[in-house]
């Protein structure tokens, strides 16, 4: 009977512990379900955010392309409506570009051609005055579009027209013959003849875009 | 004895159930911890995504404003006259004129003002590159719109804005005090400080006309 009582007491304890544990398990089960629900919500949020981010990236790419296109158009339109392209000087009916590199006469001519221009041609004393003033702060020589094969040939501009004798006197190597020909450069306001093979700065010239704007 | 055996059997069952339940609780506890960790990771992911989304939104806003500005400029430019007057160089948003006479800084400033312009202001390395290239064939100094009263004062542009220190180093008479002040000139791509009373060439600058007529 004493053993029986003791066993009954232990049984009561175990039943109590079992019930307590079952309660704990039930509570944990509910918490687990809630956690699972919360996790599902978080995953959904992540999916939504990732989708939004992807959409934003697409929109941004689109805006970026639009931007580039607009910049490109702006460059074109600006150049269209301007008498001269950027970095050129507009004077009267012409645009002038002072080269920033030194090349021989032929290479200088090519550089101008690639810019849809020709080497400098001086048609009048007004042209000469402008050029003399424009290079007044340089002591360097600048090739112009004037050359001749040898001293027995006339001085010709790139378009084949002859030099008007009253415009300026050509100094320097006027009586020299060079395999590459003799070319004219302007320096400190005076014009000189020299071997076309030498490297110098140059002046490109093209017609200004003066159609109705 | 029969009761005792029955009780013992029940006790064994209960102990077994209790152990089983304890095992279940331990397993659930581990699962819960893992779930908590996973939840923390998900929250971190959400934070990161939210931050990225915010950044993207900011970038997009910026691009959108740029776009609107470009569209606005495009509208204006589409119907505009020459961006710059004759003899000036058009580059980006500005017009530049290289003076053909030598004057002190104050006189140079007046000359620019009379042309509705100011002395050169360099805002960026791109501006500096352009100017360096534009004067590459000159060995002469050109006044720019930068000056200071004496070495204890900051270098200021004509509009009162300070010189950004990363743009260029000023050489020469930086430690000197002159009654007429100290002014900056650019020569062969470098910037020097000198007495504002000296005569030099100069560079005038004004906004290009990119507005509708």
């Amino acid at each position: 009977s004493q053993v029986s009582n003791l066993l009954k007491q232990q049984q009561t304890n175990l039943t109590h512990q079992k019930n307590k544990l079952e309660g704990q398990i039930s509570a944990r089960q509910q918490a687990e379900e809630a956690s699972q629900e919360s996790q599902n919500e978080l995953k959904e949020m992540i999916e939504t955010l990732a989708w939004k981010l992807n959409e934003k990236s697409k929109e941004q790419m689109e805006l970026h392309h639009q931007n580039l296109n607009l910049q490109e158009t702006l460059k074109r339109v600006a150049n269209c409506s301007a008498p001269c392209p950027q970095d050129w000087i507009w004077h009267e009916e012409n645009c002038y570009l002072f080269s920033t590199g030194s090349f021989n006469w032929e290479k200088s001519q090519e550089k101008c051609l690639s810019l849809d221009a020709k080497l400098l041609k001086i048609n009048s004393t007004a042209d000469l005055d402008f050029i003399q003033q424009a290079i007044s702060y340089s002591s360097f020589p600048f090739w112009m579009g004037l050359s001749r094969r040898n001293p027995s040939y006339p001085w010709l501009w790139e378009d084949g027209s002859p030099l008007m004798p009253h415009l300026f006197r050509i100094r320097g190597a006027v009586s020299q013959t060079y395999p590459s020909g003799t070319c004219a450069y302007i320096q400190r306001g005076a014009v000189y003849a020299e071997n076309c093979i030498l490297a110098a700065f140059s002046i490109c010239q093209k017609k200004a875009n003066l159609r109705a704007q | 004895s029969q009761v005792s055996n029955l009780l013992k059997q029940q006790q064994t069952n209960l102990t077994h159930q209790k152990n089983k339940l304890e095992g279940q609780i331990s397993a659930r506890q581990q699962a819960e911890e893992a779930s908590q960790e996973s939840q923390n990771e998900l929250k971190e992911m959400i934070e990161t995504l939210a931050w990225k989304l915010n950044e993207k939104s900011k970038e997009q806003m910026e691009l959108h404003h740029q776009n609107l500005n470009l569209q606005e400029t495009l509208k204006r430019v589409a119907n505009c006259s020459a961006p710059c007057p004759q003899d000036w160089i058009w580059h980006e948003e500005n017009c530049y004129l290289f003076s053909t006479g030598s004057f002190n800084w104050e006189k140079s400033q007046e000359k620019c003002l009379s042309l509705d312009a100011k002395l050169l202001k360099i805002n960026s390395t791109a501006d500096l590159d352009f100017i360096q290239q534009a004067i590459s064939y000159s060995s002469f100094p050109f006044w720019m719109g930068l000056s200071r009263r004496n070495p204890s004062y900051p270098w200021l542009w004509e509009d009162g804005s300070p010189l950004m220190p990363h743009l260029f180093r000023i050489r020469g008479a930086v430690s000197q005090t002159y009654p007429s002040g100290t002014c900056a000139y650019i020569q062969r791509g470098a910037v020097y400080a000198e007495n504002c009373i000296l005569a030099a060439f100069s560079i005038c600058q004004k906004k290009a006309n990119l507005r509708a007529q």
């Epitope: - | 060995s139 430690s175 009654p179 020097y192 000198e194 007495n195 009373i197």
Partner: antibody, heavy 119, light 111 residues
């Protein structure tokens, strides 16, 4: 230790040429303007010419304009004075002097080199 | 004929105070600073005063400079035997774009 050392002086006939040099050390050469100043025997100081940091500004006394040329080589830390069409009145000790500003004071001087123009 | 005018000579006894004047015009002293140089016999000139009144380090405070209008002056107090030398004033003339010197003043320390 700032040092300026002139050389190239000597005896030359009227109408002749001479090139003076001034070797500099002990400072950042390109941060200073450089002058030539001369002193005829028993006379006072006479300024001859100045050149700015990179040679952008060059000024001359009226008495030497068109005959003398100032130049500098910043890579060699050297100042030069090319003297052509020399006259008897160019006879003097020629000093090179350093200036922290083109129009400011001469804070260091060389010891000078004597140029004698005589037939 | 120098652009800046100085007295050819001045003298004073040891311990005394002497001043050397330098007169110019509006295009030099009037619009620019003045420098003073000391030249001891047989040596190169040495900077004594710059920016009209500034003394370089190493120059005794017995030497002082001042400027007023188109004139400047150098004052030496507590005269010493080693101060016997030639003294030159110098400025920049913006009209002629050149450095201008005075003709020099010979300082004699008596006794």
């Amino acid at each position: 230790q700032v040092q300026l050392l002139e050389s190239g002086g000597g005896l030359v006939q009227p109408g002749g040429s001479l090139r003076l040099s001034c070797a500099a050390s002990g400072f950042t050469f390109s941060d200073y303007a450089l002058h030539w100043v001369r002193q005829a025997p028993g006379k006072g100081l006479e300024w001859v010419s100045v050149i700015s940091y990179a040679g952008g500004f060059k000024f001359y006394a009226d008495s030497v304009k068109g005959r003398f040329t100032i130049s500098r080589d910043n890579s060699k830390n050297t100042l030069y004075l090319q003297m052509n069409s020399l006259r008897a009145e160019d006879t003097a000790v020629y000093y090179c002097a350093r200036s922290p500003g083109l129009t400011s004071y001469h804070d260091s001087w060389g010891q000078g080199t004597l140029v004698t123009v005589s037939s | 004929q120098s652009v800046l005018t100085q007295p050819p000579s001045v003298s004073g006894a040891p311990g005394q105070r002497v001043t050397i004047s330098c007169s110019g015009s509006s295009s030099n002293i009037g619009s620019n600073y003045v420098s003073w140089y000391q030249q001891l016999p047989g040596t190169a000139p040495k900077l004594l005063i710059h920016s009209s009144s500034h003394r370089p380090s190493g120059v005794p405070d017995r030497f002082s400079g001042s400027k007023s209008g188109t004139s400047a002056s150098l004052a030496i107090t507590g005269l010493q035997a080693e101060d016997e030398a030639d003294y030159y004033c110098q400025s920049w003339d913006y009209e002629s774009e050149r450095v201008v010197f005075g003709g020099g003043t010979k300082l004699t320390v008596l006794g």
